[in-house]
């Protein structure tokens, strides 16, 4: 009966050689795609000269196949019942699932200009930067191909900096031939309720980006959760993309290819200001841009990005405060398209379908000494792109799952 099923499940979800969980965990059997929509700026001159609202038009999807590489350096530790690994990064462009090519051009914020002016607040250094920006004929905005914007290009302004700096810039640079981790997760051998929960990330139990509880590495990596998931649970997980742990709550029952799954979503409360959700106080790291921690829906991850003023939000500033989106025209947030969800099979705790949506923004501020930023009258959190990373269990796997797991229970 039920006890036998429970026993079988407990055995099969352990992360060790020979289990169903381990096989799919080392190399995901699901095809994962990452779709990008780029925010093409329509009025760069007006913004730069008159500090107008930025008019954007999203262009996409541009689709890449991701997470197709097996985990590397998989090492079991019998003493503390953990398994450590690296998650290699790789992206392959999928022309048939895209609206154009990687050579398509976009007008976007000049990443190097925005970042350098933020990192180097010293007025004299800004004067030096200004002379280099002018010399390199750089401006507040730039035209870049999709490939350059995502994976990197040699920046002409940074190339003139007379001391050693990384001159290659890209939103996801470096990506190919890199790996995320090392992750060390519990394998569940001694305690199945801890399976896949992260013990350490990069050798630490904390991130060193945030204060207090915000800095903790909580839960799993969202690919799976400990088995026997309850609707009342709050599912914690860590996402290195957003440099923080976050959580999902039950929303609805969903039938996925004949498999009953629980849809868990990231609630708006997770993005709320500390005024509405006091737990979020430690995600507010400065007082000016956040308007004394009253703004919400954007996360300053600059500490995690070598000081570059990167802000993460949901696409189209979904769940963000009006002051954030006010200077940007052309955004249309809606929950169905822009929220993140996980469809979890409750018995195994496996995520059988997911849609992870996030937007990458860059802060640009007025600068008295940088000519191309001189006329700005306000700060802008500028949307650069948003992405939708999705994965759905394949038909064959779903059949196997139905016959071996849900079928047995029903």
């Amino acid at each position: 009966g039920d006890l036998l099923i429970q026993k079988t499940i407990k055995k099969q979800v352990v992360l060790e050689e020979g289990t169903i969980a381990f096989k799919n965990w080392v190399k995901t059997g699901t095809e994962v795609y990452r779709q990008f929509w780029i925010f093409d700026v329509q009025n760069p001159q007006e913004v730069m000269m008159n500090s107008s609202n930025i008019q954007v038009k999203q262009r996409g999807p541009y689709t890449y196949r991701v997470r197709f590489l097996a985990k590397e350096n998989v090492t079991q530790d019998a003493e503390d019942n953990t398994v450590s690994f690296l998650q290699p990064n790789g992206a392959i462009f999928e022309p048939s699932l895209s609206v154009g090519t990687e050579a398509d051009n976009f007008t976007v914020l000049n990443l190097a200009v925005a970042a350098a002016s933020h990192i180097y607040q010293n007025q004299f250094v800004q004067m030096i930067l200004n002379s280099l920006i002018n010399k390199s004929k750089s401006s507040m905005f730039q035209v870049r191909t999709l490939r350059e914007l995502l994976w990197g290009y040699r920046d002409p302004f940074l190339s003139l900096v007379p001391y050693p700096v990384t001159t290659t810039v890209g939103l996801f640079y470096p990506y190919n031939n890199t790996a995320d981790g090392v992750y060390k997760v519990f394998n569940g051998k001694d305690n199945i309720s801890k399976v896949a929960i992260i013990d350490t990330y990069k050798g630490k139990r904390n991130l060193s980006y945030w204060e207090s509880h915000c800095d903790m590495i909580n839960g799993t990596d969202a690919a799976s959760f400990p088995p026997f998931v309850e609707k009342s649970q709050v599912l914690q997980f860590f996402s290195s993309d957003i440099c923080r742990s976050i959580y999902a709550v039950f929303e609805s029952d969903v039938n996925l290819k004949g498999i009953p799954v629980y849809r868990f979503v990231l609630p708006s409360k997770a993005f709320a200001s500390p005024v509405e959700n006091p737990d979020n106080y430690c995600f507010c790291t400065e007082k000016i841009i956040s308007k004394n921690c009253t703004s919400y829906g954007v996360l300053d991850i600059s500490k995690c990005k070598e000081g570059r003023p990167v802000y993460i939000s949901l696409p189209h500033f979904l769940y963000a405060s009006p002051d954030v989106s006010e200077p940007i025209d052309g955004l249309n947030p809606n929950e169905e398209e822009h929220r993140t969800y996980l469809d979890i099979e409750p018995i195994t705790g496996f995520t059988l379908q997911f849609a992870k949506r996030l937007q990458v923004n860059l802060l640009v501020k007025p600068s008295e000494k940088i000519q191309v930023l001189k006329n700005l009258k306000r700060n802008y959190i500028v949307p650069i792109l948003w992405l939708n990373e999705t994965g759905t269990i394949g038909d064959e796997k779903a059949n196997m799952f139905r016959s071996q797991v849900t079928g047995k229970i029903n």
């Epitope: 007025q123 002379s131 001391y163 008295e368 000494k369």
Partner: antibody
């Protein structure tokens, strides 16, 4: 209070080099870059260049790029300017002056000046 | 390089009179002009910084105005202690450049 104490007057031979010093006190030395300014009756005040005491990074007026080199010693809160291959044109009063930092004003504090006389 | 043209080169003014010194820049520098006073044997002293801002402790008879390329420095009523050389400095771009100076004397 902020003080910039410069080294004494120098009489040097043409073709020689000289090193001037400027010791800072009364503020956090690494928070502000230090500038050097040349003054002569003919050319008036001219900005030579600056050194960032935190990093040791320098920036120069092109006119003085081959003439001056700037260094900073954090342990003694002192900046140095070496002038090379001196000619009579280099005879002047040289001032160090504190920069803007992240906030402040340009050249709000000055050393008392060092007179350099180049003569055979 | 932004050149700064200062006029007049010298000025003789009676006590209580108004003094006006002008600096014109070769490029638009917004309001990034500074004004200095230098007495014999002393380093220059900053009177007015960027944005026509009077420095703390500087008497209110000193003022400045201007934006872009044309700047004016004013002493509302001349005192004998104001006898000095006056310089303007543009701090908009590198290299910093000074005006050639104005020698202010008492009549």
């Amino acid at each position: 209070q902020v003080q910039l104490q410069q080294s004494g007057a120098e009489l040097v031979r043409p073709g020689a080099s000289v090193t001037l010093s400027c010791k800072a006190s009364g503020y956090t030395f690494t928070d502000y870059e230090m500038h050097w300014v040349k003054q002569t009756p003919v050319h008036g005040l001219e900005w030579i260049g600056t050194v960032d005491p935190e990093t040791g990074g320098t920036a120069f007026n092109q006119k003085f790029k081959d003439k001056a080199s700037l260094t900073a010693d954090k342990s003694s809160s002192t900046v140095y300017m070496e002038l090379r291959s001196l000619t009579s044109e280099d005879s002047a009063v040289y001032y160090c002056s504190r920069g803007y930092g992240n906030y402040g004003a340009w050249f709000a504090y000055w050393g008392q000046g060092t007179l350099v006389t180049v003569s055979a | 390089e932004t050149t700064v043209t200062q006029s007049p080169a010298s000025l003789s003014v009676a006590t209580g009179e108004k003094v006006t010194i002008r600096c014109i820049t070769s490029t638009d520098i917004d309001d990034d002009m500074n004004w200095y006073q230098q007495k014999p044997g002393e380093p220059p002293k900053l009177l007015i910084s960027e944005g026509n801002t009077l420095r703390p402790g500087v008497p209110s008879r000193f003022s400045s105005s201007g934006y872009g390329t044309d700047f004016v420095f004013t002493i509302e009523n001349m005192l004998s202690e104001d006898v000095a050389d006056y310089y303007c400095l543009q701090s908009d771009n590198l290299p910093f450049t000074f005006g050639s100076g104005t020698k202010l004397e008492i009549k």
